[in-house]
């Protein structure tokens, strides 16, 4: 003989436990439907009756099956760093995430807590890595033959152009200048002394680590003062 | 701008040879290294040296080269590659070329980016008895 | 010492196929690498340095990618003109480590 369907509220069997979406009430000692997500339990049940749900109220929220007598508070509105990318409604919380040029300093269980803005490398320095939703950017010096002239969180050192006839020697954070003789290298259009990379790798791929030997040379012009420690700049 | 190299010959194993590069269109004092690279008959690429050709002309070498081999600066348009104690296996097209300078600050040590953007024909060293 | 180790030593393509030329350093070199072509009886060429810049004149065929120790040249859409002696070179010249050439890599054009 099939096994008869038990209706809620039941009491279920001894050793045994109560099936799925219900929940063993002690009070009732009975097996009791639990709500859906984005309701609570109104009234919980009894030997005779089943749990009462309601809908969650405005900025409250369930997001699993339950029987919480009342909603979760949906957390505080996100702050001017950050980005909505869930909304609060019946049964989710906001999810507040990092603006673009910002990482998460301090996670939480879901979003982030705390932002903080993306470390811009000074020029003569370029990113080393990346920064991610979760860490920020590295800088590095620029290598000998590269430089970087922009205050950034994405630019990479770029190698120097090549030029036919050099009227400024290249630094760390200046590209090579060339004389009025066009330079071997290809130029971008409206794009004067910038190297073009053929692949179409943005700026935001792997960038070339740092020499081992700390690099360089004494060229033409006078040496410069060293630059800081650090190459970043503040926001 | 172009590069010409001169001074190759047949010579008995031994002996010395002077190379002469000669630039055109540009001076070998601004910004640039001039480099020299050769090519065995049938064979791949094998760098020599390079000497920057300002004021103090430093200069660079393979490891293999250092000794024999000898660059120097002559005039602000030539650059020269001594050679001594040939022997049949520097048998070899020999090619100046020049490589672009760059400065940078705050770094200590010797490095070099080295990209040959101008060469010359060659010259070929024969050495033979 | 540095090595590059060019692969493969010699490949045909026909024209309009692909070729791909491979350059393994025997240590890092931090992208510092540049490729020639030469041409029998001529000079070589600088094609593209710094890993993946292109030189100008030099067509948009041709790419350079890679990085660390592994790089590679690409020809796409080979042309008879392509027919030629490829060479890569560590442009990275320090106190412990030296410029150096792979052995060459000669392309043939059906």
């Known amino acids: 003989l099939p096994a008869q369907v038990a209706f809620t509220p039941y009491a279920p069997e001894p050793g045994s436990t109560c099936r799925l979406r219900e929940y063993y009430d002690q009070t009732a000692q009975m097996c009791c439907s639990k709500c859906s997500p984005g309701q609570h339990a109104k009234v919980f049940c009894t030997k005779t009756s089943d749990t009462v749900c309601d809908s969650c109220e405005d900025s409250t929220y369930t997001q699993l099956w339950n029987w919480v007598p009342e909603c979760l508070s949906c957390g505080s509105r996100c702050s001017s760093d950050q980005v909505e990318t869930q909304a609060c409604t019946r049964e989710q919380n906001r999810i507040c995430t990092c603006r673009p040029g910002w990482y998460c300093a301090l996670s939480k269980q879901e979003g982030c807590r705390l932002c903080a803005p993306l470390r811009k490398c000074r020029p003569g320095f370029g990113v080393a890595r990346p920064g991610t939703e979760t860490s920020d950017v590295v800088c590095k010096p620029c290598a000998p033959g590269t430089f970087s002239n922009t205050t950034s969180s994405t630019d990479i050192c770029r190698p120097h152009q090549i030029c036919n006839v050099v009227a400024i020697p290249g630094n760390a954070s200046m590209d090579a200048v060339c004389t009025s003789t066009s330079p071997t290298r290809s130029m971008a259009p409206g794009a004067v002394h910038l190297p073009q990379p053929v692949s179409t790798r943005s700026q935001h791929t792997q960038p070339t680590p740092e020499p081992s030997t700390a690099p360089s040379t004494s060229f033409l012009l006078p040496m410069g003062p060293s630059p800081p420690a650090e190459g970043s700049t503040g926001d | 701008q172009s590069l010409e190299e001169s001074g190759g010959d047949l010579v008995v194993p031994g002996t010395s040879l002077t190379l002469t590069c000669t630039a055109s269109g540009f001076d070998l004092s601004s910004f640039y290294y001039m480099c020299w690279v050769r090519q065995a008959p049938g064979k791949g690429l094998e760098w020599i040296a390079c000497?920057?050709?300002?004021?103090?002309?430093?200069t660079y070498y393979a490891s293999w080269a250092k000794g024999r081999f000898t660059v120097s600066r002559t005039s602000s348009t030539t650059a020269t590659l001594q050679m001594t104690s040939l022997t049949a296996a520097d048998t070899a097209t020999y090619f100046c070329?020049?490589?672009?300078?760059?400065?940078?600050?705050?770094?200590?040590?010797?490095?070099?980016?080295?990209?040959?953007?101008?060469w010359g024909p060659g010259t070929l060293v024969t050495v033979s008895s | 010492a540095l090595v590059m180790t060019q692969t493969p030593a010699s490949v045909s393509a026909a024209v309009g196929g692909t070729v791909t030329i491979n350059c393994q350093a025997s240590e890092d070199i931090d992208s510092y690498l540049a490729w020639y072509q030469q041409k029998p009886g001529q000079p070589p060429k600088l094609l593209i340095y710094?890993?993946?810049y292109l030189t100008s004149g030099v067509p948009s065929r041709f790419k350079g990618s890679g990085s660390g120790t592994e790089y590679t040249l690409t020809i796409s859409g080979v042309q008879c003109d392509d027919a030629a002696t490829y060479y890569c070179q560590s442009a990275f010249y320090s106190n412990n480590t030296e410029t150096a050439f792979g052995g060459g890599t000669e392309v043939v054009v059906k």
């Open positions: 710094y890993a993946s």
């Open positions: 070329a020049r490589h672009q300078s760059y400065e940078t600050y705050g770094y200590v040590g010797v490095v070099y980016a080295t990209y040959f953007s101008l």
């Open positions: 000497i920057y050709a300002v004021s103090s002309g430093s």
